[in-house]
């Protein structure tokens, strides 16, 4: 039996976390967003995250409670999507004590392309998903996951690596995006915001969700990650948005309850094996898919992104625990660890379901759907 996470058929209501925030603010992460015309006036003058007084000293803002059970992304209110910046501003900075190019952070300098040139690539992640522009692709079949229900032993390593919390997965977790598109799960990690500030990496029509889970997979065509980096389809990431709901998510609690043990950057602990699939939405048939990149340096491209249409519900307390427990570089809280959305540059996001079909009064004129390229072409 699956752990209770959300009711699957409720439409989106008006209480989604972050919905009332100005769009511009939702798109001001601590790093590479450049000011946009859509941002509220003066917002571009806000200091970067690391110039602010300690984020932990800001008053805690509890997200609104989620009355409806399940968010369906295609039902999100139509809003003007932020314009893609002409040039991605992939900012990070190195430690003063070292000149190593791998010393990147969210926020500050130098630009990420100096850390890794691939970060200036044309097909980067994350992106803003606009369901109306997605190409319905019937060839995209339900995802297949095998071996994701892990026994308590052996235990798994949970680590604060300074830019996320990462759970290392054992061998044997198999995932198929479709026939002949087979992968092995390697690790999962999360991205989040701060009190009252959403922190998902992908957005939907400019809407940023409270948090996002990424399960990273290596194609079975490759023996090691090094070989797969930058190769089309070499890596695949399953991504799901985390949203506030009325109940505690028991699957996530198995991880969140251990975060205090790894509050310090670089620390780790062992946690019992758990049902990894319970951390994902239950509907494996409805998703968006596109080719992009790693969202952190080295920003290698060729990554197949699969973003679930259904979201996962966590309680307000759990979302607060996620965003307010860990510490990162420079004695600062590990918060707002998301990259700005990157331009599509002609890419078409595919949908496994007719996400662009809209029967509501909001559709004033016919929508021209993009055409689908069959999966695997």
């Amino acid at each position: 039996q699956r752990l209770p996470r959300m009711q699957e058929d409720s439409p989106l209501g008006g209480g989604s976390s972050g919905e009332d925030d100005p769009l511009g603010e939702e798109d001001l992460p601590s790093e590479e967003d450049s000011p946009r015309e859509e941002d509220p006036p003066g917002e571009e003058d806000l200091p970067g995250e690391e110039d602010l007084p300690g984020e932990e000293d800001l008053p805690e803002v509890k997200p609104k409670s989620e009355e409806e059970g399940s968010l369906k992304l295609e039902d999100l209110p139509t809003v003007e999507a932020p314009g893609d910046p002409q040039e991605p501003q992939n900012n990070a900075h190195r430690d003063k004590e070292g000149d190593d190019q791998s010393h990147w952070r969210y926020g500050g300098d130098p630009p990420w392309p100096r850390v890794s040139p691939a970060c200036a690539g044309r097909f980067q992640s994350p992106v803003d998903i606009r369901p109306q522009l997605a190409a319905f692709c019937p060839a995209l079949r339900p995802l297949e996951l095998l071996g994701f229900q892990l026994p308590p032993l052996p235990e798994l390593r949970l680590r604060n690596n300074g830019h996320s919390v990462q759970l290392t997965l054992p061998p044997g977790l198999e995932m198929a995006l479709g026939p002949g598109r087979e992968y092995r799960a390697l690790q999962l990690h999360l991205h989040w915001g701060a009190a009252g500030r959403p922190g998902s990496e992908h957005t939907v029509e400019g809407h940023r969700f409270p948090a996002e889970i990424h399960v990273v997979h290596l194609s079975t065509a490759f023996a090691r990650v090094d070989e797969a980096l930058g190769r089309p389809g070499g890596l695949a990431v399953l991504a799901a948005f985390l949203e506030e709901g009325p109940e505690e998510n028991s699957a996530y609690e198995q991880l969140l309850s251990r975060l205090e043990e790894i509050a310090e950057e670089g620390s780790e602990t062992q946690v019992p094996g758990l049902d990894i699939s319970a951390l994902l939405p239950s509907d494996f048939s409805r998703y968006f898919q596109y080719e992009g990149s790693l969202t952190t340096p080295p920003c290698a491209q060729g990554v197949i992104w699969t973003v679930f249409n259904q979201t996962v519900m966590l309680s307000a307390k759990q979302l607060h625990t996620l965003s307010d427990t860990l510490w990162g570089p420079g004695d600062s809280r590990l918060q707002l660890n998301f990259r700005a959305t990157q331009p599509l540059n002609g890419r078409v996001i595919e949908a496994s379901f007719p996400a662009g079909v809209d029967s509501s009064p909001r559709a004033a004129e016919p929508v021209q759907l993009n055409s689908c390229l069959a999966a695997g072409d």
């Epitope: 004590e97 070292g98 190593d100 390697l186 690790q187 090691r224 090094d226 670089g266």
Partner: nanobody, 114 residues
Framework: QVQLQESGGGLVQPGGSLRLSCTAS????????MGWYRQAPGKQRELVAT???????NYADSVKGRFTISRDNAAKTVSLQMNSLKPEDTAVYYC????????WGQGTQVTVSA
């Protein structure tokens, strides 16, 4: 798999020192969190020390003040300097590289005995 080659193990008297080294054949060494773990006979593998890509170190309580982990990104090497060794440090020491994937060396035996 990512090749991790450990060296430096051996037999040493209590109070003595050893330096373990691990060389990685990976183009993404700079992004890896490198670590040393150990497994004594009949026991589970346990953390000894780790060092992140930003050179943030983390040690097991039992080795703090005695062991020092360091990395040389240019040489793609992580080292573990072990001082004031005790009999209970006897184990097989494994090198680990973790980033997107998780990779292990074959291990090197460290024996602390008079």
């Amino acid at each position: 798999q990512v090749q991790l080659q450990e060296s430096g193990g051996g037999l040493v008297q209590p109070g003595g020192s050893l330096r373990l080294s691990c060389t990685a054949s990976t183009s993404s060494f700079n992004f890896q969190t490198m670590g040393w773990y150990r497994q004594a006979p009949g026991k589970q593998r346990e953390l000894v020390a780790t060092i992140t890509s930003r050179a943030i170190t983390n040690y097991a309580d039992s080795v703090k003040g005695r062991f020092t982990i360091s990395r040389d990104n240019a040489a793609k090497t992580v080292s573990l300097q072990m001082n004031s060794l005790k009999p209970e440090d006897t184990a097989v020491y494994y090198c680990n590289a973790a980033w997107i994937g998780d990779y292990w060396g074959q291990g090197t035996q460290v024996t602390v005995s008079a």
